[in-house]
Amino acid sequence: KFSKQSWGLENEALIVRCPRQGKPSYTVDWYYSQTNKSIPTQERNRVFASGQLLKFLPAAVADSGIYTCIVRSPTFNRTGYANVTIYKKQSDCNVPDYLMYSTVSGSEKNSKIYCPTIDLYNWTAPLEWFKNCQALQGSRYRAHKSFLVIDNVMTEDAGDYTCKFIHNENGANYSVTATRSFTVKDEQGFSLFPVIGAPAQNEIKEVEIGKNANLTCSACFGKGTQFLAAVLWQLNGTKITDFGEPRIQQEEGQNQSFSNGLACLDMVLRIADVKEEDLLLQYDCLALNLHGLRRHTVRLSRKNPIDHHS
């Protein structure tokens, strides 16, 4: 469950984040799983660990393999796995499927293409963008922060988009490229006040102390591609990241689905090793878009183990 797939190209920088997260003060140890050999933290090494990040500067095909990260706190250890694959650079223009990040779809109103994984790197604007290997030129294309905006999107804009940027580490520069497909939705969409499908308002979820629990916040926002729609969890009215409980994590990235033609998002809240104090918290599922915000609150209750009488 706490394993993450990462990939990159040889001679490019690759930075991987430990799938298990903790407070910045916690130490994170990295190991190469096949040999159980510790990854050094000294930056003079080509491959080194830097807290939650594992850095390949630059990556080599031989770096491929499974890396283990252990987040250590005074009270617990958490283990995650990063499955890293480094590929040889392709001589031709085609980007193979295994190098592609998730497909994004756009419409006339919303045509943002985010550069995948860029937030892990120390980069400076502007980004370079390519479509099907051709550098993008013309006033319709605007590189803005970490994404590309295409004005007046047309069906012909569908294709594979590659962002290229430079990662800087202690004065040394490394190239990074990432590619994802962009599809154009030619449909007349509409947007509604958010509708939360799950959880039900004031739902009580039964959990077992010491076990893991998942809460899913799922909401729909209208039809077609939605602009500025989001679902998120809060604990007692506090953002998950600010709450400071590493056992409780929001799943990275929102899953988008189209249910009966409706655009829906869901966000999973994972609670590891449920404790008594978790039963005292209010878990707020928030769904918001330009129309407004809707909140459903969940509380946890202890599931009584079934007595087995002889």
């Epitope: 009215g237 209010q282 915000l293 909140r295």
Partner: nanobody, 119 residues
Framework: ESGGGSVQAGGSLRLSCAAS????????MGWFRQAPGKEREGVAA????????FYDASVRGRFTISQDNAKNTVYLQMNSLKPEDTATYYC?????????????????WGQGTQVTVSS
């Protein structure tokens, strides 16, 4: 509410609303306005836990709603004011299960402050 007054078109005003008597955290705070002979209309709203903001199309880009959690206070910064912004402005609060510029989501209302914009 406070901060109302008279101003020339193109000018700015900042309205304040200090909240008390209910749970400010996890609430929805909003600004509404009513011009003489017209219906009350929503202007802006903010969800106090996280500061998510919502605006009516007529003021988006000109008005900004913000908050100071330490003071349980919400502000409405009004720039590029127009004569049609003239109205009594009301601060309102709701429980937070919904947050938008819709009056039915609010159950606490202030007394109102007058804003007059002359051309």
């Amino acid at each position: 509410e406070s901060g109302g007054g008279s101003v020339q078109a193109g000018g700015s005003l900042r309205l304040s609303c200090a909240a008390s008597g209910f749970t400010y955290r996890r609430a929805c705070m909003g600004w509404f306005r009513q011009a003489p002979g017209k219906e009350r209309e929503g202007v802006a709203a903010i969800y106090t836990s996280g500061g998510m903001t919502f605006y009516d199309a007529s003021v988006r880009g000109r008005f900004t709603i913000s908050q100071d959690n330490a003071k349980n206070t919400v502000y409405l910064q009004m720039n590029s004011l127009k004569p049609e912004d003239t109205a009594t402005y009301y601060c309102a609060a709701g429980g937070g299960d919904y947050c938008a510029t819709n009056a039915r989501f609010f159950n606490y209302w202030g007394q109102g402050t007058q804003v007059t914009v002359s051309s």
